[in-house]
């Protein structure tokens, strides 16, 4: 006997876009208030009723007069084949499912979408299908003519299909890949004919779970949530993504306007705990992430403001700043960094409620500093605020060091011309802008005789003309606050410099290594003096102060050049501040071969000899230490007499070479000559690194024996 609650009024509708069959039916003879757990067995056949492709048991609770619904998604586009659907029902007795009493089957409902297709000779399905990468997709063509041979191509590559009926073939695509945002192209065409159809299969990259989801507040009014959405799906035009924030304690939800961030209004009823779910969603998929936090643990303070400096003195300054009110009056930890010349020189941590204050000490006078401050929640650190930076300059002080002073003394017409030099004080020594230098000249024989001279900055020298007595000179640097300690130097008419022997030193690329004998008795220090540009009239005088226990130093300068002779003088400074010359040194940072030959004067020409002299040749101005001279003599005879040796020149000519080993000997008699003979001579200096150029020889012919001198 048939079950009284059989399914009735089965209607089947289709959704081609989603490839869905939608079933709707009812159960009659069920009282209005009656509820019954039932199971419906649904069978779906394709092409013919005997070809069952799907069986499913659908369990639900049925009420009287209720319309029931069930949907089925087909892998094959519905346009590709006829589908048949029928169902039967049973009371769902979970205890004995094998003893179910099924109703009769409903009659088959036929769904044939092909009936509604147009009159085109060829159709390809599905249209505008949207799938994720890695999916399997079934496509098909429907041909209106069985005579046509039809080929289908995936991105130009022919696909192998299976025939469903004479007019329909289907193609299974496995693990489809994302190719491009405009989708994957599929074309089907009649092999011999003009008919062609194309469809686009939109393959999306898989929607990623949002990463690095985080929320914070800056003002306790708004929570700012951010995340990394990951790679986009590649189909943003066809498959827009949406992001939704849901907070479970309040039950509120907001649709985010942006792809990577969203703002949430903090509840005025001072909700502290927040449990957020961020959902990324597109047509194909949903992805959710969660965070639970206490609002007070997610405070990212705003940058401090109103940074000021008060009570700025020579070495101290008081820094003050304000922090933005957070309503709950919790404590902030503020970090202060003090910069001098671009480097961090001090770091401080300060606890702050509303206003911050810090005394910065140990500062240098007249120095520009930069201080920056940032703050974070002291109790539950989350993030530092941005830095707020402000500059200030400490107050000037009197210069702290005496200027480094030296002198050059010359005797001119019975007077002593003293050029005083001083080095500008460093910024740390000057403690402010140096405005002028005061020079006090005290006659040591008449202590009341004082001269005062003021030299405006930035001058670094002055000239004094004094008579040949002893003077004590005081030099001070002055800024707007005061005067530096004095530098004291004694000059006297007789420097007594000339008796000191000069010693040669060899320079290197690092400079000149100088040493001297320690001086007995009271000495306050040493000074090494030299000229950076000895060939210039002003010479660019340099000096270096050294302590009383120092007996060596290395003098280096960027001005040192190869082939230039540098003269160093080492002075001792007595306790009376009198400098006296101890040693003289001379040398080259690098010796070069002599660059020119002496201008030679020939005299005393006889039939057997002549005299060569080069008295005005300065060995000091040469690019290396001259060790002597070579005299070259060319003759037709080519005979070399004792005292000379045969030499082959660069032009392969042969001559006689005489060697003079004394650089001071600037005269030479060439003898053993033949009367009425033609000779050529050349004089070149030589040094440790080579000799002068082999330039033009000078021609000379000896007279006959009877010619007058």
């Amino acid at each position: 006997e048939p079950l009284p609650w059989a399914p009735e009024s089965l209607k089947v509708s289709i959704n081609s876009t989603h490839q869905c069959l939608h079933l709707q039916w009812s159960v009659h003879n069920l009282a209005y208030h009656q509820e019954l757990k039932m199971v419906f067995q649904i069978e779906i056949s394709r092409i013919k009723t005997s070809n069952v492709i799907w069986v499913e048991n659908y369990s639900t609770t049925v009420k009287g007069n209720q319309l029931l619904h069930w949907s089925w998604e087909s892998q094959l586009p519905l346009e590709c084949a006829k589908h048949f659907i029928r169902m039967r029902s049973a009371v769902d007795d979970a205890t004995t499912p094998e003893q179910r009493f099924w109703s009769n089957w409903s009659s088959w409902e036929e769904v044939d979408v092909q009936n509604s297709l147009g009159h085109e000779p060829l159709f390809v399905f599905p249209k505008d299908k949207l799938v994720e990468e890695g999916s399997n997709v079934t496509i098909c063509y429907v041909s209106r003519s069985q005579q046509n041979n039809i080929s289908c191509y995936l991105e130009g590559v022919r696909m192998q299909g299976q025939q469903l009926d004479p007019n329909v073939s289907m193609f299974n695509l496995h693990n489809v890949a994302f190719i491009r945002e405009t989708g994957t192209n599929i074309y089907c065409k009649v092999d011999r004919g003009d008919d062609i159809k194309g469809i686009v299969l939109f393959v999306s990259k898989i929607l990623e779970e949002p990463k690095d989801f985080s929320c914070e507040t800056r003002d306790f009014q708004t929570l700012s949530c951010t995340w990394d959405p990951g790679r986009d799906t590649g189909l943003l035009k066809q498959l827009p993504q949406s992001y939704t924030l849901f907070e479970s304690f309040s039950g509120k939800k907001t649709l985010c306007k942006h792809k990577g961030w969203c703002n949430w209004q903090v509840a005025p009823e001072s909700q502290e705990m927040y449990n957020f779910t961020l959902t990324a969603e597109n047509y194909l998929r949903k992805r959710s992430v969660h965070i639970l936090f206490n609002l007070t643990h997610r405070v990212h303070p705003m940058a401090p403001f109103n940074v000021l400096f008060k009570d700025v003195s020579v070495t101290n300054a008081t820094m003050t700043w304000k922090v933005h009110s957070t309503g709950n009056y919790y404590t902030l930890l503020c970090q202060v960094e003090l910069y001098g010349e671009g480097k961090v020189i001090q770091k401080h941590n300060v606890s702050v409620k509303v206003n911050g204050e810090l005394v910065l000490s140990g500062l240098e006078p007249d120095t520009e500093y930069s201080a920056q401050v940032r703050c974070a929640n002291a109790n539950h650190f989350w993030k530092w605020s941005e830095w707020t930076r402000q500059n200030f300059t400490t107050v000037e002080a009197a210069p702290s060091e005496a200027p480094d002073v030296w002198r050059n003394v010359k005797s001119v017409q019975g007077y002593c011309v003293v050029t005083l030099f001083w080095k500008p004080l460093s910024r740390l020594q000057a403690n402010g802008e140096i405005l002028f230098y005061n020079i006090v000249v005290e006659d040591l024989d008449r202590p009341s005789g004082l001269q005062l001279l003021s030299v405006p900055a930035p001058a670094n020298r002055t000239e004094l003309t004094l008579d040949q007595r002893a003077y004590q000179i005081h030099v001070t640097a002055n800024n707007s606050v005061g005067t530096s300690p004095a530098s004291v130097l004694v000059v006297s008419g007789d420097p007594g410099d000339e008796e000191v022997e000069e010693e040669r030193v060899k320079g290197t690329e690092d400079g000149f290594s100088l040493s001297w004998k320690p001086q007995p008795g009271n000495i306050t220090g040493y000074i090494v003096e030299w000229c950076d540009r000895p060939r210039d009239p002003l010479c660019d005088l340099q000096w270096k102060h050294l302590g009383p226990n120092t007996t060596s130093t290395v003098i280096s300068s960027d001005a040192f050049r190869p082939g230039v002779r540098y003269n160093f003088r080492i002075y001792g400074i007595s306790t009376e501040m009198v400098p006296y010359l101890l040693e003289k040194k001379t040398g080259y940072s690098q010796e070069l071969a002599p660059s020119d030959n002496p201008r030679v004067v020939m005299s005393n020409l006889t039939s057997h000899s002549f005299t060569l002299s080069w008295k005005d040749y300065s060995t000091e101005s040469q690019p290396s230490f001259i060790r002597g001279y070579h005299v070259y003599l060319k003759s037709k005879a080519g005979q070399c007499h004792p005292g000379s040796e045969k030499a082959v020149l660069s032009d392969d000519s042969v001559c006689c070479k005489y060697k003079i080993d004394d650089p001071k000997q600037k005269m030479f008699v060439v003898g053993n000559l033949q009367p009425e003979s033609f000779y050529e001579f050349l004089v070149t200096p030589y040094s440790a690194v080579g000799e002068g150029p082999h330039g033009a020889f000078t021609k000379v012919t000896t007279p006959d024996e009877y010619s007058p001198m």
């Epitope: 297709l117 147009g118 009159h119 085109e120 159709f123 249209k127 505008d128 191509y153 991105e155 130009g156 190719i179 491009r180 945002e181 405009t182 989708g183 192209n185 074309y187 062609i196 159809k197 194309g198 469809i199 686009v200 035009k237 066809q238």
Partner: antibody, heavy 117, light 107 residues
């Protein structure tokens, strides 16, 4: 015979509007993507917009999105292009085209739009 | 947007000579390239799609090749009826874009 016939082209002042129509025949209109492509006098081709089979998805040249609207009426086998706030640079021959996919296998003869004061 | 740069802008060859037009994409477009022919006073006509597939009814002297960024279109033996402007088009990304065209004439 497969045919696309455009109409609606005219001389219009800058700031004005026009609606272009394209009637399709000889094929199942609803079975194809459709598009508009334009060609300024003496110049090359420029894609304007595309529409899918049922009109649920539209695609535009970004610079035209706010002023142009593509639509279709499958019952009438007709494609439309509504053009607002027209500018001198919109002067062109407007072709109605059928898409194989995003490539265009059938073209109408075009309708001329002239924007000038 | 993807720029399609066609070269040469024009060429003049003798009948039965081989014509080669190149099209360079500013980004990788895979094989999503079509070629069109536009004769004077007419609408364009599709010749090649997917870079190398000849459209139905297109003579075999027309061919296309390439993938990624470099594409070429060839007429193996130029006929008088081939005098036209030829355009490439990419359909890999929105907006769809065309090359500036190559004018082919017969000497």
């Amino acid at each position: 015979e497969v045919q696309l016939v455009e109409s609606g082209g005219d001389l219009v002042k800058p700031g004005g509007s026009l609606r272009l129509s394209c009637v399709a025949s000889g094929f199942t209109f609803s079975d194809y993507y459709m598009a508009w492509v334009r060609q300024a006098p003496g110049k090359g081709l420029q894609w304007v917009a595309n529409i899918n089979y049922d009109g649920s998805s539209t695609y535009y040249l970004d610079s035209l999105k706010s002023r142009f609207t593509i639509s279709r009426d499958n019952a009438k086998n007709t494609l439309y292009l509504q053009m607002n706030s027209l500018r001198a640079e919109d002067t062109a021959m407007y072709y109605c085209v059928r898409g194989l996919t995003w490539d265009f296998d059938v073209w109408g003869q075009g309708t001329l739009v002239t924007v000038s004061s | 947007e993807i720029v399609m740069t066609q070269s040469p802008a024009s060429l003049s060859l003798s009948q039965e000579e081989k014509v080669t037009i190149t099209c360079k994409a500013s980004q990788d477009v895979d094989t999503a390239v079509a070629w069109y022919q536009q004769k004077p006073g007419q609408a364009p006509k599709l010749l090649i799609y997917l870079a190398s597939t000849r459209h139905t009814g297109v003579p075999s002297r027309f061919s296309g090749s390439g993938s990624g960024t470099d594409f070429s279109f060839t007429i193996s033996s130029l006929e008088p009826e081939d005098v036209a402007v030829y355009y490439c088009q990419q359909y890999s990304r929105f907006p769809l874009t065309f090359g500036q065209g190559t004018k082919v004439e017969i000497k």
